[in-house]
């Protein structure tokens, strides 16, 4: 039977080393056996490269393409093949489709004056364009109360957040996770970091009396 693409490839770049494209076929497909995504930088002398896709779901394929440190002018020609049959052709400009890397190593430390210090690592090296462009969203939620959650936007440079213990329920277990985006690149949000959990042992002032 003929092979058809249901949802054409959607691609994002981490703007440092990898671009990922995902698409959906019209029926369950063994992506790695049946399909190939070729990509070539639109630059004089560049070579054609081939990405072997993997299955994300029965009919969803994903391809991770190693790219050089991206620059704004880079444009890739993409061609999706099923054997000799060209299923889809398009172009992709990494700088226009940025999905930042996930922030790492989220930790929570008790700090002075009944505050918690949340720290994480910027996923980009200092020399990368995105290092100084990231802002973050931190989600803090009560593990036992789905309605008790807070969202903090960290728009300053440092990957830290100070949290007053008094803003959280005493004795409750909380989890935090963080994600990043790059405003100047009009990026999408990164994936959420793994959660880190801690016990908020702050004692309210009234109980102290």
């Amino acid at each position: 039977g003929s092979v058809k693409v249901l949802h054409e490839p959607s691609c994002f770049s981490d703007y440092i080393s990898t671009s990922v494209c995902q698409w959906k076929m019209d029926h369950p497909t063994n992506c790695s056996a049946e399909l190939r995504l070729s990509y070539q930088l639109d630059f004089m002398g560049s070579e054609n490269h081939t990405c072997v896709p993997e299955n994300r779901e029965d009919s969803v394929c994903v391809c991770s393409m190693p790219i050089d440190d991206a620059v704004e002018a880079d444009v890739y020609q993409l061609d999706l093949w099923a054997g000799q049959q060209l299923l889809w052709s398009g172009s992709f400009q990494p700088s226009k489709h940025v999905k930042p890397r996930t922030p790492g190593n989220l930790t929570v430390h008790p700090n002075i004056s009944h505050t918690w210090l949340l720290m994480w690592t910027n996923p980009y090296p200092t020399e990368n364009h995105l290092h100084s462009e990231l802002t973050y969203m931190v989600n803090v939620s009560n593990d036992n109360d789905p309605e008790d959650f807070k969202v903090y936007n960290v728009t300053y440079m440092g990957p830290t957040l100070r949290l007053a213990a008094s803003t959280l329920k005493s004795g409750a277990s909380y989890s935090a996770r963080v994600r990043a985006w790059a405003q100047t690149y009009n990026s999408t949000w990164s994936d959420w970091s793994p959660s880190t959990t801690w016990l908020n042992y702050y004692e309210p002032w009234e109980q102290h009396l």
Epitope: L41, F43, M44, G45, S46, E47, N48, H49, P66, I67, D68, V71, E72, A73, D74
Partner: antibody, heavy 125, light 112 residues
Framework: EVQLVESGGDLVKPGGSLRLSCVAS????????MTWVRQAPGKGLQWVSL????????YYADAVKGRFTISRDNAKNTLYLQMNSLRAEDTAVYYC??????????????????WGQGTLVTVSS | DIVMTQTPLSLSVSPGETASISCRSS???????????LDWYLQKPGQSPQGLIY???KRASGVPDRFSGSGSGTDFTLRISRVEANDTGVYYC?????????FGQGTKLEIK
């Protein structure tokens, strides 16, 4: 030591054909794009054609498009220029040169960093 | 096509002086920060061309530091300090950004 040795230049009549060769040594030939550049007597340099490392992508100057074909044999470390429908204005010394490194996603550029000694093509009746 | 224009077309300099050659392109040769696809070549009398400068300012292997390239976008300069008799020849700029690759007309440097 990098060496490029061109051959195949000759006196040929207008409308005739010629095949130039350039044998390379001293570097990993398949990793680099190669170019042909020509120089008419007493004139400046004129780029003719470029081929990437795999041979999968070729580029031509408008003056030779449709008449000249650049190719390479990476097993023999040899670059070729097939010249058909030759005209008097194709008379020149033809140089081959090593160009950008194309095995990376974005070619690494060093300019035309090594040149051959040139081979003379004369088109005259 | 990108047009490359060199000035002057000829230059006469005394040994030990500095020679400057200008090259202007009809379109920007800046692909990304620090990457101007502009080269300088020297063709000595009776010889093949040789690379001097690539990416606007990077010296090719074995080229003395008397040769320096500068500029960005559309305006570039080759400077040869402490000129020697051996520097005589024709200097060409060339854009390596897009097909067709194009050379300047050449600047003939004569040593007095």
């Amino acid at each position: 030591e990098v060496q490029l040795v061109e051959s195949g230049g000759d006196l040929v009549k207008p409308g005739g054909s010629l095949r130039l060769s350039c044998v390379a040594s001293g570097f990993t030939f398949r990793d680099y794009a190669m170019t042909w550049v020509r120089q008419a007597p007493g004139k400046g340099l004129q780029w003719v054609s470029l081929i990437n490392g795999s041979g999968g992508k070729t580029y031509y100057a408008d003056a030779v498009k449709g008449r000249f074909t650049i190719s390479r044999d990476n097993a023999k470390n040899t670059l070729y220029l097939q010249m058909n429908s030759l005209r008097a204005e194709d008379t020149a010394v033809y140089y081959c040169a090593v160009d950008r490194l194309t095995k990376t996603i974005r070619p690494q550029y060093y300019g035309m960093w090594s040149w051959g000694q040139g081979t003379l093509v004369t088109v005259s009746s | 096509d990108i047009v490359m224009t060199q000035t002057p077309l000829s230059l006469s300099v005394s040994p030990g002086e500095t020679a400057s050659i200008s090259c202007r392109s009809s379109q920007s040769l800046l692909y990304s920060i620090g990457y101007n696809y502009l080269d300088w070549y020297l063709q000595k009398p009776g010889q093949s061309p040789q690379g001097l400068i690539y990416l606007g300012s990077k010296r090719a292997s074995g080229v003395p530091d008397r040769f320096s390239g500068s500029g960005s976008g559309t305006d570039f300069t080759l400077r040869i300090s402490r000129v020697e008799a051996n520097d005589t020849g024709v200097y060409y700029c060339m854009q390596g950004l897009q097909s067709p690759l194009t050379f300047g007309q050449g600047t003939k440097l004569e040593i007095k």
